[in-house]
């Protein structure tokens, strides 16, 4: 058992059929010695008494808030939340495998630049009774300092007959150089409550691996005299990092006829302009990347040609 | 995905080709490192990531663009020099790019270069002969060193009697690239920056 | 009508052990949480430890110590055993559905003596 919060505690059960469970002592907190009595919940039924109680937690009947009473006054609450161990592993029902990059992905995180902000985020099927918080530092064994929000909900989505929901926070480092070679990853730690399940996600990653640039802004078309050809153009987006000579990115240019079918030309350039050949009914666009380390594409940004 | 191939201008500062050329080779290196050592824990989850420079070196804090110097989470250990030498800052004058940052990066290429020629040696004795050095990568290492034309003692190459355990070696050898991408990273951003100054 | 019959008291030495039954009808025994309780001659109703519907244990204290209860749901039947016996455990003990004692047996009369 460890405390999560004050007065909230986490029991850790190895979680099979007939599991004897953990021995947990309770203590009111009162200088109070006699006449103290134990409920749980909203129940009303006495289950103990005595300063300090002895229960045995085997399952989410077990948990719960347990009061502490003498003549009809509270004297203290103690929450107990249960973290479940099935076969070794640590459950993962309350937040959604997104399965991308890979299996076993419950966090995905974002940064727009090299200043030491990024956006985490995670999903959910559950709409009720939900909690989250979230705490990051940079290397684990002499952490440095990373600042996260709150968890908000993001978005919703229906996905067949299930309702999704998106969470994300934000988090910044507090003292991040954008130039720095990271050499120990971000470590970002979610703690999740639904109802008296707790569970706990983690997620390790360098800046550098998830930066994914804003797309280019001010996209825009120059048509050539006497030609099919035009003069795109674009800017680097806002929230890139500067001196943008430093921190350089690269580009790809997609000329894209209406139908998906169409063979799309694309041409890489580390200029921010760029000759294309104009369809009828096509649309160009641009996206970014950095230019020295292949993280991610940012989305599209898109122009018609006509 | 292959970075785009520059063709410098004639008047354009020499050691950017040259810093290009030695991030596409250090990364193509690790990516066939990281296919033919699947077995082995080659990728960025599994290595530990050491810098063989570290307190050798101080190429990020001198090499700073004069933008980040006002950051003062960049400015650690800035040792801050403003005198220029060098071939690559030909006869372009900046208060940005020092001496020391050119030297420094010198430096990191050489302690790189013994590193790996050190090791392609115990690999080359290895019977399995799963993974040698890319000499293109050894090459363009040897072509940036010229480019810069810093004059410093030779360091000899490190000579093992032991014999070599080739599993470590191996993954040293991952380690050793995951490190030199990054730093390569850095040095292709401050000659894109000194191009642009 | 609720009805609940203690059973397996009895003199034994000190270090000994007893295990007490109770037998239950008259109400939904599995879904019950139940207590056990004991009165020493010239004292009030003391608390020994509470079994809920899943056999989930309460004891006072910070552990168990000699008394572990459990029940037998097919049974309708809950149980205490008690072990390392000394001279003050000597006392009237009651199987009760409440802490307080107001629905409970008649009780079963252990007495620790050598």
């Known amino acids: 058992i460890w405390e999560l919060k004050k007065d909230v505690y986490v029991v850790e059960l190895d979680w099979y059929p007939d599991a004897p469970g953990e021995m947990v002592v309770l203590t009111c907190d009162t200088p109070e010695e006699d006449g103290i009595t134990w409920t749980l919940d909203q129940s009303s039924e006495v289950l103990g008494s005595g300063k300090t109680l002895t229960i045995q937690v085997k399952e989410f009947g077990d948990a719960g808030q347990y009061t502490c009473h003498k003549g009809g006054e509270v004297l203290s609450h103690s929450l107990l939340l249960l973290h479940k161990k099935e076969d070794g592993i640590w459950s993962t029902d309350i937040l959604k495998d997104q399965k991308e990059p890979k299996n076993k992905t419950f966090l995905r995180c974002e940064a727009k630049n090299y200043s030491g902000r990024f956006t985490c985020w995670w999903l959910t099927t559950i709409s009720t009774d939900l909690t989250f918080s979230v705490k990051s530092s940079r290397g684990s064994s002499d952490p440095q300092g990373v600042t996260c929000g709150a968890a908000t909900l993001s978005a919703e989505r229906v996905r067949g007959d299930n309702k999704e929901y998106e969470y994300s926070v934000e988090c910044q480092e507090d003292s991040a150089c954008p130039a720095a070679e990271e050499s120990l990853p971000i470590e970002v730690m979610v703690d999740a409550v639904h109802k008296l399940k707790y569970e706990n996600y983690t997620s390790s990653f360098f800046i550098r691996d998830i930066i994914k640039p804003d797309p280019p802004k001010n996209l825009q078309l120059k048509p050539l005299k006497n030609s099919r050809q035009v003069e795109v153009s674009w800017e680097y987006p806002d929230t890139w990092s500067t001196p943008h000579s430093y921190f350089s990115l690269t580009f790809c240019v997609q000329v894209q006829g209406k139908s998906k079918r169409e063979k799309k030309d694309r041409v890489f350039t580390d200029k921010t302009s760029a000759t294309v050949i104009c369809r009828k009914n096509a649309s160009i666009s641009v996206r970014a990347q950095d230019r020295y380390y292949s993280s991610s594409w940012s989305e599209w940004a898109s122009v018609p040609c006509s | 995905r292959n970075l785009p191939v520059a063709t410098p201008d004639p008047g354009m500062f020499p050691c950017l080709h040259h810093s290009q050329n030695l991030l596409r080779a250090v990364s193509n290196m690790l990516q066939k490192a990281r296919q033919t050592l699947e077995f082995y824990p080659c990728t960025s989850e599994e290595i530990d990531h050491e810098d063989i420079t570290k307190d050798k070196t101080s190429t990020v804090e001198a090499c700073l663009p004069l933008e980040l110097t006002k950051n003062e989470s960049c400015l650690n250990s800035r040792e801050t020099s403003f005198i220029t030498n060098g071939s690559c800052l030909a006869s372009r004058k900046t208060s940005f790019m020092m001496a020391l940052c050119l030297s420094s990066i010198y430096e990191d290429l050489k302690m790189y270069q013994v590193e790996f020629k050190t090791m392609n040696a115990k690999l080359l004795m290895d019977p399995k002969r799963q993974i040698f050095l890319d000499q293109n990568m050894l090459a363009v290492i040897d072509e940036l060193m010229q480019a810069l034309n810093f004059n410093s003692e030779t360091v000899p190459q490190k000579s093992s009697l032991e014999e070599p355990d080739f599993y470590k070696t191996k993954i040293k050898l991952c380690i050793l690239l995951h490190a030199f991408r990054i730093r390569a990273v850095t040095i292709d951003r401050v000659m894109s920056y000194l191009n642009a100054s | 009508e609720v009805q609940l019959v203690e059973s397996g008291g009895g003199l034994v030495q000190p270090g000994g052990s007893l295990r007490l039954s109770c037998a239950a009808s008259g109400f939904t025994f599995s879904s019950s949480v139940m207590f056990w309780l004991r009165q020493a001659p010239g004292k009030g109703l003391e608390w020994l430890s509470t079994?809920?519907?899943?056999?989930?244990?309460i004891y006072p204290g910070s552990g168990k110590g000699r008394f572990t209860i459990s029940r037998d749901n097919a049974k309708n039947t809950l149980y205490l055993q008690i072990n390392n016996l000394k001279p003050e455990d000597t006392a009237l003990y009651y199987c009760?559905?409440?802490?307080?004692?107001?629905?409970r047996g008649q009780g079963t009369q252990v007495t620790v003596s050598s």
């Open positions: 009760a559905r409440d802490i307080g004692g107001t629905v």
């Open positions: 079994i809920k519907p899943t056999g989930s244990t």
